[in-house]
């Protein structure tokens, strides 16, 4: 067990042109808050997939009102860390989504309105117990600077928070075979004995005699990959005849808890422990109703008239996401041919074509070689929207007008003489050298009997020959 901690340092306009407008104004003061979603592994799942490692919501930041005419500065941030507790082992590799939300504090009916300002995502490797890792992510014209770390909750220690520490029994040293628990040198690694046969790679224990599985593994000894479940046996190990160790489906399999809720089995079913801001049997209710205006960009809110029923946003064309907060990236379909640059102007798509191509989707290939001539017997080659000359031997340059000297780059080593030849170049090697470019001394530097290295050189040392 442990805690993932996120510290937001700044949120403001990124470098470069096109600074964003301040999200707040004198007429509409606002404040920021952040949401973090964590998933195990290096998954590239959709933003809406469950935050299986956990999620957290920050407190609201100070109220901010834009000073008229002033550029958007770094915006005032909420105090404190965002903390995402994890109950099991820290996976080491994880994916994150950090969302910056704006809460408008105008006098609109129904209380404050929320809108998503920016969303950044990434995949990282991180060992628990390590130092703070710093990061900068950009979303559009906004830039988010933050640090994060994972730390184990005592008595857990180690890079995955799976080793346990106990206070020392003797003042001087730990028992046989047990290390001190850095950085807690006054504690010793506990002699934790998992269930006999528990997989050292895929299982761990927090109490002696148990065997708990890392994600993706199952069975009493965590030796069976979840995906290979071909057994339809009752829950628990089946009879010896099938040799099948895969448990049947359990109520928490596939994690029925949404929004980062953690699932625990009960005698009859399951129970979701929901993160702050969510509730319901499966943490599917966010505490937000249609009265709060949760649908952005003209989305139509349906349901959710009372706090116990969830709302659904029906998004207008061009937007998607559970709150219609994401613009559909029509350029992701790559409508522009031949390397054209796609511009989504909102009302229309526009393709900016590379040289040599034209048409609404850059589908027309112009004749690159039309009216172009290559000198000295060179031939024009079309391609990529720019003509290129394939030059005859002995000539070079864009239009084959330059006489090429194959010997200009001193291509013969060890004093070999270079001769330009109709087929390229020829090296006439100095005595004692051979190879196409005279790069191999026949008897290196006259090295005589042992030691077996050129004089004054140990094998492995570089030696300069000009």
């Amino acid at each position: 067990a442990g805690v993932f901690e996120l510290q937001i340092h700044s949120f403001g306009p990124g470098p470069g042109p096109g600074a964003p407008r301040s999200p707040c104004s004198a007429r509409l003061p606002c404040r920021l808050f952040f949401r973090v979603c964590l998933k195990p592994g290096l998954s590239e799942e959709a933003a809406e997939s469950p935050c299986a490692l956990g999620a957290a919501l920050s407190a609201r930041g100070p109220v901010y009102t834009e000073q008229p005419g002033a550029p958007a500065p770094d915006l005032p941030l909420p105090d404190g860390l965002l903390q995402v507790p994890f109950r099991d082992a820290w996976p080491g590799t994880f994916s994150f989504i950090i969302e910056t939300w704006r809460e408008e504090l105008g006098d609109q009916i129904g209380g404050p309105a929320w809108s998503l300002l920016a969303r950044v995502a990434g995949r990282r490797r991180l060992a628990a117990g390590g130092p703070w890792a710093r990061d900068i992510q950009r979303a559009g014209a906004w830039e988010l600077r933050f640090s994060y770390r994972a730390r184990c909750e005592p008595p857990a220690v180690g890079t995955a928070c799976t080793r346990l520490c106990r206070p020392r029994s003797a003042p001087s040293r730990c028992g046989p075979g047990l290390r001190p628990c850095a950085p807690l040198e006054d504690e010793c690694e506990a002699p934790l004995v998992c269930r006999a046969g528990c997989s050292p790679e895929h299982g761990f224990c927090e109490q002696p005699g148990e065997c708990r599985c890392l994600e993706g593994w199952t069975g009493p000894l965590c030796t069976v990959p979840v995906s290979t479940s071909s057994c339809l046996s009752p829950r628990g190990p089946s009879s010896a005849t099938t040799g099948c160790l895969v448990p049947g489906p359990g109520p928490c399999d596939g994690n029925p808890c949404a929004n980062g809720g953690s699932c625990s089995e009960t005698p009859r079913s399951f129970e979701c422990t929901c993160p702050r801001g969510f509730y319901g049997l499966r943490c599917e209710v966010s505490g937000v109703t249609c009265a709060d205006g949760p649908c952005f960009n003209g989305g139509l809110c349906v349901g959710g008239a009372d706090p116990d029923s969830a709302y659904i946003c029906h998004c207008p064309p061009g937007f998607q996401g559970s709150n219609c907060e994401k613009r559909v990236d029509r350029c992701s379909l790559q409508p522009c041919r031949n390397g054209g640059l796609c511009l989504d102007l909102g009302h229309a798509l526009r393709c900016r074509c590379r040289a040599g191509f034209a048409g609404p989707r850059c589908e027309h290939d112009l004749d690159d070689c039309a009216g172009r001539a290559c000198a000295n017997g060179g031939t024009c080659v079309e391609g990529g929207g720019a003509h290129r000359c394939s030059c005859a031997l002995g000539f070079g340059g864009r239009d084959c007008r330059e006489r090429a000297d194959p010997c200009a780059a001193r291509p013969c080593a060890h004093g070999g003489r270079c001769y330009a030849h109709f087929s390229g170049l020829v090296c006439a090697c100095a005595p004692g050298y051979m190879g196409a470019r005279c790069e191999f001394p026949v008897h290196p530097d006259g090295a005589s009997a042992l030691p077996a290295a050129p004089p004054g050189l140990r094998p492995g040392d570089p030696q300069r020959y000009l």
Epitope: A413, A436, R437, E439, F440, P444, D461, P462, Q463
Partner: nanobody
Framework: EVQLVESGGGLVQPGGSLTLSCAAS????????MAWYRQAPGKKRELVAG???????DYIDSVKGRFTISRDNAKNSVYLQMNSLRAEDTAVYYC???????????WGQGTLVTVSS
């Protein structure tokens, strides 16, 4: 700085075969001209086979048809396949690299090949 590490030497009977490997680090072998040299006790070090940057190969007369030098760009290594080995092939075999950008040569530490019945 280019580092060269040879491996694959050992004891082999006359007529047997052996493959020597030379793993390079610090530069890609495709940018280097590389060769195998050998030095028998009491004798000068001599070139055995070379492979130029462009892939052309050279051999001394006594190994032509028996030894083959090759390069694997993906593994960043050069190999010497030695067939029909003779007692006179017994020597320490050294890997050599010539770096064209700096015109500097580099040597490995050597691997011993013993041909004996």
């Amino acid at each position: 700085e280019v580092q060269l590490v040879e491996s694959g030497g050992g004891l082999v009977q006359p007529g047997g075969s052996l493959t020597l490997s030379c793993a390079a680090s610090g530069s890609r072998v495709s940018f280097l001209s590389m060769a195998w040299y050998r030095q028998a006790p009491g004798k000068k070090r001599e070139l055995v086979a070379g492979i130029s940057k462009d892939g052309s190969t050279d051999y001394i007369d006594s190994v032509k048809g028996r030894f083959t030098i090759s390069r694997d760009n993906a593994k960043n290594s050069v190999y010497l396949q030695m067939n029909s080995l003779r007692a006179e092939d017994t020597a320490v075999y050294y890997c050599y690299a010539y770096r064209w950008t700096t015109r500097v040569t580099y040597w490995g530490q050597g691997t011993l090949v013993t041909v004996s019945s």
